[in-house]
Every structure is written in structure tokens, then in C-alpha cells.
């Protein structure tokens, strides 16, 4: 499934814009803010009432090659006694990010941007109850 | 850059790392085909650590619009629907990659940018510091 094209002309095209072949765009993969650090509260994945584990997926043909995915540890949530309460639900929270994929076709190489959905963590929710007539 | 396995039959001139600048097809592929139907957009209200969503728009960025979470309470919602301050609502943050127009306003020239977004909130047991 494809989404609409990125990068059609808008404003007045400045003269300083680099020339780009039709049907493609120039992408500098030197990341802005590469060294910023996440200042998330300490080990919230273990302290949460909807705890989660992390898995690192690694793909040498993807940039960045490492993408970290979270998985909820339980179906229910952890109560004050440290027991799983199945009257509540642990659910994944997801966020979209972009990656660059390198594709080999014979000896030629092409690059494709992809939207990827990352599971970031989990939250505890009250379930939706469906009443059957 | 990162190391890329090469077809051994190909000429050796190709750099095995990702180059600094690449030409990318204008179509962005959506790997999230048939996104999880269980994925709900009302978790922000049903969570024991509910959050509000704030709209952030920047036309020089792709995606231009990002909705960011801000926890509604310091504490968490208990079974009675009240805020329990013995627990804490904390944001779940994630670094994501977006595209930044560079130079600005250029239609087909971008640079990857890492930004930190708050995606939602989760309820945690607080860290208690005992003062001697």
C-alpha cells in the first residue's frame, strides 16, 4: 500500500534548492539531533501497572538498522498487591516513525522511505464491555 | 553508516555502508498494512493514566502534523474514578525519525531529523527516596 507523494512544489521554489531527478527526492541521512537523549523516567517499563519488555529488531538493509519494539507482559494490569488483575487490560501504545530501506536489484541499489509502526510501551485501560442482546 | 551485505558478483566500487546522501523514490511505502484492528484511538480516555492530545504542526516537516500526549494528572485513576496520588502518571516518550526540508521550502530536498515525542502515559509505582 502506498501513500500520496511527498514533496510537491510549494511556496516559490528557491534558486538554492538542489537539482533533483524527477520522481525522486534528495535525502541527507546525517540525522539532525542525533545525540539527543530520551529523558524518560527510570525503568518505567518495570514499574508500570502495565509492564512491558523490549525486543530489538535488526535489519542491515534498514536505516536505522535497530528498531526497538515493546511487548506488554500481561493481558491484565498489575494491582497494588503485585497480582495481575484481568478486569483491566494492558494495551500497547504505538507511534509511527520513518526508516530508509536499501533495496538490491541485481547489482543496482535503490532507496525507499518507509513508514513503520513502533510499539513504544503499554498503558492500563478499562475494558470496553460489549453487552450481547 | 551501517554495514550492508553485498552480492558477491557485483563490482566492488559500491560502499557497503549507507551513503550520507541518497536519492529516494517520492512514494513512501506504508509498512503498516492493515494496521492492527484492535488498535484503539480512545486509550487516552480509558487509561488509568489518561492523557490529552496536543496538535503540533510544522509545514517544513514530514509528517507535518504530530499529535503529542500530555498526562492529565500527576496521579492515576483508581477503581472509584478518583485520582490516586500514591501512583504516578508518566509520559511514554519515543525518539522518531521525521523529514526536515533542507534548505527550507525546498520541495524535494530533506534531511532526517530525530525528534522526541510523548506518545501516551502509563501508571507507575513511584520511586520513594528515604531521607536519612
Amino acid at each position: 500500500r502506498k501513500i500520496p507523494k511527498v514533496g510537491h512544489t510549494f511556496f516559490q521554489k528557491p534558486e538554492s534548492c538542489p537539482p533533483v531527478p524527477g520522481g525522486s527526492m534528495k535525502l541527507d541521512i546525517g540525522i539532525i539531533n542525533e545525540n539527543q537523549r530520551v529523558s524518560m523516567s527510570r525503568n518505567i517499563e518495570s514499574r508500570s501497572t502495565s509492564p512491558w519488555n523490549y525486543t530489538v529488531t535488526w535489519d542491515p538493509n534498514r536505516y536505522p538498522s535497530e528498531v526497538v519494539q515493546a511487548q506488554c507482559r500481561n493481558l491484565g494490569c498489575i494491582n497494588a498487591q503485585g497480582k495481575e488483575d484481568i478486569s483491566m487490560n494492558s494495551v500497547p501504545i504505538q507511534q509511527e516513525t520513518l526508516v530508509v530501506r536499501r533495496k538490491h536489484q541485481g547489482c543496482s541499489v535503490s532507496f525507499q522511505l518507509e513508514k513503520v509502526l513502533v510499539t513504544v510501551g503499554c498503558t492500563c485501560v478499562t475494558p470496553v464491555i460489549h453487552h450481547v442482546q | 553508516g551501517i554495514t550492508i551485505p553485498r552480492n558477491p558478483g557485483c563490482p566492488n566500487s559500491e560502499d557497503k555502508n549507507f551513503p550520507r546522501t541518497v536519492m529516494v523514490n517520492l512514494n513512501i511505502h506504508n509498512r503498516n498494512t492493515n494496521t492492527n484492528p484492535k488498535r484503539s484511538s480512545d486509550y487516552y480516555n480509558r487509561s488509568t493514566s489518561p492523557w490529552n492530545l496536543h496538535r503540533n504542526e510544522d509545514p517544513e516537516r514530514y509528517p507535518s502534523v504530530i499529535w503529542e500526549a500530555k498526562c492529565r494528572h500527576l496521579g492515576c485513576i483508581n477503581a472509584d474514578g478518583n485520582v490516586d496520588y500514591h501512583m504516578n502518571s508518566v509520559p511514554i516518550q519515543q525518539e522518531i525519525l521525521v523529514l526536515r526540508r533542507e534548505p527550507p521550502h525546498c520541495p524535494n530536498s530533506f534531511r532526517l531529523e530525530k525528534i522526541l515525542v510523548s506518545v501516551g502515559c502509563t501508571c507507575v509505582t513511584p520511586i520513594v527516596h528515604h531521607v536519612a
Epitope: V6, F11, Q12 | S41, Y44, L53, S64, V65, W67
Partner: antibody
Amino acid sequence: EVQLVQSGAEVKKPGSSVKVSCKASGYTFTDYEIHWVRQAPGQGLEWIGVNDPESGGTFYNQKFDGRATLTADKSTSTAYMELSSLRSEDTAVYYCTRYYRYESFYGMDYWGQGTTVTVSS
Amino acid sequence: EIVLTQSPDFQSVTPKEKVTITCSASSSISYIYWFQQKPDQSPKRWIYATFELASGVPSRFSGSGSGTDYTLTINSLEAEDAATYYCHQRSSYPWTFGQGTKLEIK
């Protein structure tokens, strides 16, 4: 073909509520926000607010905050606008329009056909 | 709230004439959008991001401007251009529209 099909005309009493639907087809519903705009008889256009079907996020023109509620159902690709505590000044044509989240300079590109809401005692 | 003031409110024009509609913003905005609306129809996106013509819009239309002053120009008016044109800003909340300019063909 992109289409935004809105529900039919409504006649309401002052103080009551109205809920207008907007069914989207021909595109990926969650790639676009849904904005709502109204037009009183013989008047100009007035922005009510926005709903993001993907995240569930909403943002309102302060004038309508507390009275308007924007929601969406991803399973049916339908957006809704509910307006409560209706008064005669709310008599207008209500439009839904889509807005691409990824490249916002396109603006509001497709519009629904409009729903006439008449508030009269 | 950014107020958009269009000028003129109403204009009666002869075919083939050049028409200029201006939109003045009470504060600086990054770009403007123009919509065309005909009686009993929904608005149509006409010009986006100040300069870009929406698909299907004849090339006799053009958009320009920056800061607080923006213009929609029709180089050689045709009968089908009779409509009300609205400018729109989304640089600041709440998003606002101009009061509209009604073009009538003489």
C-alpha cells in the same frame, strides 16, 4: 474516487443537540485529519475544529469548545460532529473536509456536500 | 485571532477583464489558501500554499503574496469564474476565513 458523504438535513429545537456524520471513502482514512467548518445563511465560513482519526486527538475553535464534540470511527471511516445547547445562531450548513497529516501545505482539499442544520422553536 | 479582510466584497466584471482580489491579514502569516464557492455548492480548494493551483483550476488563475498581503488574480475572466472566493489562514488558531468576495459577470 475520494468522497466525503454527509448525513441529511436536520431540524432541531433550541437547547437540543445535533450529530452530523461524514463517511469517507476512496482514501486511507487515518492518513487525514477531519476538519469541520460551518456557514450560516448568506454568511462566510467559520472553522469549528479538527479530529485526528488515527490518535483520537481533537482541537476546537474556542468559540465552540465545550459545545462541539468531534469523534471518528476508524472501523467505518466515519467522522462525527455533535453540537449541543443549540441556539438559533447555530442554523447553518456544516461541512466536513479532510486535511493530509503528512504534507500540510495541501490544506483542506476535499469537502463533504454539507449538512443543513436548522434550529427553530 | 487573525482577521482576514478581503477586498472588494463584491465586483461586477466583464469577461476577458483582469480581476484582482486582495486578502489582508491582521498579523503576518506563512501562506494563504483560496476557496471558490458557487451557490448551493461546497467550497472547492482553488489555490493552496499561496501559489499552487489545485488540480483542474485553469492557468488564468494565480496566487501571490507574503506576510500580511495576499492576492488572487484572474488574468482573463470567463463566465464560469462567477463565484464567491474566500481566503483562509491556518498559521494561527483559530483558523479563519475572509468574509468572501463575490464575482459577478456583467
